[in-house]
């Protein structure tokens, strides 16, 4: 059974992930981002189901494409370079989902824009955090 300290650690990691995802979304949605129009032509794959930490596998698999699209954006919209930002997110995701469990991600039929994709994972983080508090 999860201890209160492990639950607290999970909650903090989720909050960190949430902040990183929100920072990316705010950066690309910034009205000064001239690349947004082009970024919206790239598509992302959404999880068929995202209710447990193991489902973060679906996010992990989309991090490389996310980095490639973020490279289009002007770096001044973010505090970190896309490579560093995605690397940070990857570390958190690996810790949260657990690297020892093998979970095959199932994707929904519908794909999403970068904005829809980020909003989906932001909602996921918020939902899990609410169950922990």
């Amino acid at each position: 059974a999860p201890t209160s300290s492990s639950t607290k650690k999970t909650q903090l990691q989720l909050e960190h992930l949430l902040l990183d995802l929100q920072m990316i979304l705010n950066g690309i949605n910034n009205y000064k981002n001239p690349k947004l129009t082009r970024m919206l032509t790239f598509k992302f794959y959404m999880p068929k189901k995202a209710t447990e930490l193991k489902h973060l596998q679906c996010l992990e698999e989309e991090l490389k494409p996310l980095e490639e699209v973020l490279n289009l954006a002007q770096s001044k919209n973010f505090h970190l370079r896309p490579r560093d930002l995605i690397s940070n997110i990857n570390v958190i995701v690996l810790e949260l989902k657990g690297s020892e469990t093998t979970f095959m991600c199932e994707y929904a039929d519908e794909t999403a824009t970068i904005v829809e994709f980020l909003n989906r994972w932001i909602t996921f983080c918020q939902s899990i955090i609410s169950t922990l508090t």
Epitope: P34, T37, R38, L40, T41, F42, K43, P65, L72, E110, T111, T113
Partner: antibody, heavy 115, light 108 residues
Framework: QVQLVESGGGLVQPGGSLRLSCAAS????????MTWVRQAPGKGLEWVAN????????YYVDSVKGRFTISRDNAKNSLYLQMNSLRAEDTALYYC????????WGQGTTVTVSS | SYELTQPPSVSVSPGQTARITCSGD??????AYWYQQKSGQAPVMVIY???KRPPGIPERFSGSSSGTMATLTITGAQVEDEADYYC???????????FGGGTKLTVL
Amino acid sequence: QVQLVESGGGLVQPGGSLRLSCAASGFSFSTHWMTWVRQAPGKGLEWVANINQDGGEKYYVDSVKGRFTISRDNAKNSLYLQMNSLRAEDTALYYCARGYTISDWGQGTTVTVSS
Amino acid sequence: SYELTQPPSVSVSPGQTARITCSGDALPRKFAYWYQQKSGQAPVMVIYEDSKRPPGIPERFSGSSSGTMATLTITGAQVEDEADYYCYSTDSGGDVSVFGGGTKLTVL
């Protein structure tokens, strides 16, 4: 409603020049990418060039690079296509279109390159 | 240079389902857009972002994408759907935009 009205087409000899214009209305011109698309007689659509909101980014199909220049004047809600060193294969109906992924089209202006 | 490949023609009887395909190497990561062009008219967008329908486009028009193939489906094609259909997308970097060669839909 969105209106895009092209002008400036006509008959020109090979090697000649033309400047197409597009007057835009019914939307916030300065916040949209704009695009030129052409269609040769009896043929399909061909993307020619596009330009971002402030004119800082411009992209062209290979066949017109170095000959055509896309530009815009946000104060006048106008899009332009300067066409130099025209060739017979540039003969087409030229459409002005709104967006990077095109949502609205003008009715087109005809360019004929012939001696 | 980047290319999108469509069949030159598709024929269906009224009420049948018409499927028009578009293949391109970047389509697993880039959205496809579909345009209808009736004779002598400017094109009209019928599908954007693979599967979304703009306002005013009949429900019989739908789109999907899988791997390198995007598909426009017209369920219960009508005589007025007879037109040329073009897919449109961008290369993997997003610098080059391209139309497919177009598909002539005949509703006999």
